[in-house]
């Protein structure tokens, strides 16, 4: 594959990454799969600057990101280290709340109205953001 040099149509470029912002909702796993099919991943927030960029584009709407603890510890989908990385949880979050009546706890992270993060039921259909890095090799064949 060739190195991607510009973002696909309808994606937004920012700091050598491309972002796609959904306008409807999906469960976390479906959103994750959607991004993977686009040769991307759910957004991984690594800095305050990136947080503000994403927040500006999504507006005050609950929106999935690529962070979950479905297998125990919190993990970013691209392997970025959670413990040492950027975090922006709401007060008292994550809390793995069981009181929602949907079954189980809360294992997936999302941006809330003010941009701070909350853990929620992964089955809830929220909007989502895909991200792919411009510098990574594309799966598309090179143009001849």
């Amino acid at each position: 594959g060739s190195e991607r040099t510009c973002c696909p149509v309808n994606w937004v470029e920012h700091e050598r990454s491309c972002y796609w912002f959904s306008r409807s909702g999906k469960a976390w796993a479906d959103a994750d799969n959607y991004c993977r099919l686009e040769d991307a991943h759910l957004v991984v927030v690594t800095s305050w600057e990136e947080q503000k960029f994403v927040q500006h584009h999504i507006g005050p709407v609950n929106t999935w990101m690529g962070l979950h603890d479905q297998n125990g510890p919190w993990k970013w989908v691209d392997g970025t280290d959670y413990e040492t990385g950027f975090k922006n949880w709401r007060p008292e979050q994550p809390d793995d709340w069981y009181g929602h009546g949907l079954g189980g706890g809360e294992d997936c992270a999302h941006f809330t109205d003010d941009g701070r993060w909350n853990d929620d039921v992964c089955q809830r259909p929220y909007r989502w953001v895909c991200e792919t890095e411009l510098d990574k090799a594309s799966q598309e064949p090179p143009l001849l």
């Epitope: 909702g25 469960a27 709401r90 009181g99 929602h100 909350n118 089955q123």
Partner: antibody, heavy 121, light 112 residues
Framework: QVQLVESGGGVVQPGRSLRLSCAAS????????MHWVRQAPGKGLEWVAI????????YYTDSVKGRFTISRDNSKNTLYLQMNSLRAEDTAVYYC??????????????WGQGTLVTVSS | DIVMTQTPLSLSVTPGQPASISCKSS???????????LYWYLQKPGQPPQLLIY???NRFSGVPDRFSGSGSGTDFTLKISRVEAEDVGVYYC?????????FGQGTKVEIK
């Protein structure tokens, strides 16, 4: 404009079954969670069931669990409520209602006019 | 299940006068996302319910500004600053923080 039209109500004997339908138009049906809400004659509102936009998740109020099944056909823009083992206390006007947004919103902003189900021997 | 308790259950109001309805929930309706999942609906005679207020205090589109909602946690209030004849009907509060979603018993508002 958004329209929800329920049908399938009527008089049915206790223990029998009935299937309600709700035909949706004026919006992208497959993007929205849908609900059934009922109202017994002269009484208040009772939430009955919810189904996810894609049909993957369904939840019910305790009094109908195991008897009622909510389903949808996104190709037909139609919501259903299969009601089995009906009881006198299921007598009500049944409304279908649409979620407020095409993502989880926690409220209904559009309702149908309702269809009356009467369970009586 | 979360129990929603409305008071009063009926209200007779002179046109132009204010009205207030209280709704109390048996558990906090504040979610981890910072929203409070409390809603107000009005059901006019012979009609399905219509949304008035979402997330405690936000008026739904087309709802007159004489309607306002307030409260937090478990205690909520719907106020009508000046009641008009078209405001008659039954007002319901509803919570959706927990399945099953539950409604208050309803408050019937009539004009004196």
């Amino acid at each position: 404009q958004v329209q929800l039209v329920e049908s399938g109500g009527g008089v049915v004997q206790p223990g029998r079954s009935l299937r309600l339908s709700c035909a949706a138009s004026g919006f992208t049906f497959s993007n929205y969670g849908m609900h059934w809400v009922r109202q017994a004659p002269g009484k208040g509102l009772e939430w009955v069931a919810i189904i996810w936009y894609d049909g993957t998740n369904k939840y019910y109020t305790d009094s109908v669990k195991g008897r009622f099944t909510i389903s949808r056909d996104n190709s037909k823009n139609t919501l259903y409520l299969q009601m089995n083992s009906l009881r006198a206390e299921d007598t009500a006007v049944y409304y279908c209602a649409r979620e407020g947004h095409d993502f989880w919103s926690g409220f209904f902003c559009y309702w149908g006019q309702g269809t009356l189900v009467t369970v009586s021997s | 299940d979360i129990v929603m308790t409305q008071t009063p259950l009926s209200l007779s109001v002179t046109p132009g006068q204010p009205a207030s309805i209280s709704c109390k929930s048996s558990q906090s309706l504040l979610h981890g996302d910072g929203k409070t999942y409390l809603y107000w609906y009005l059901q006019k005679p012979g009609q399905p319910p219509q949304l008035l207020i979402y997330e405690v205090s936000n008026r739904f589109s087309g709802v007159p500004d004489r309607f306002s909602g307030s409260g937090s946690g478990t205690d909520f209030t719907l106020k009508i600053s000046r009641v008009e004849a078209e405001d008659v009907g039954v007002y319901y509060c509803m919570q959706s923080i927990q399945i099953p979603w539950t409604f208050g018993q309803g408050t019937k508002v009539e004009i004196k």
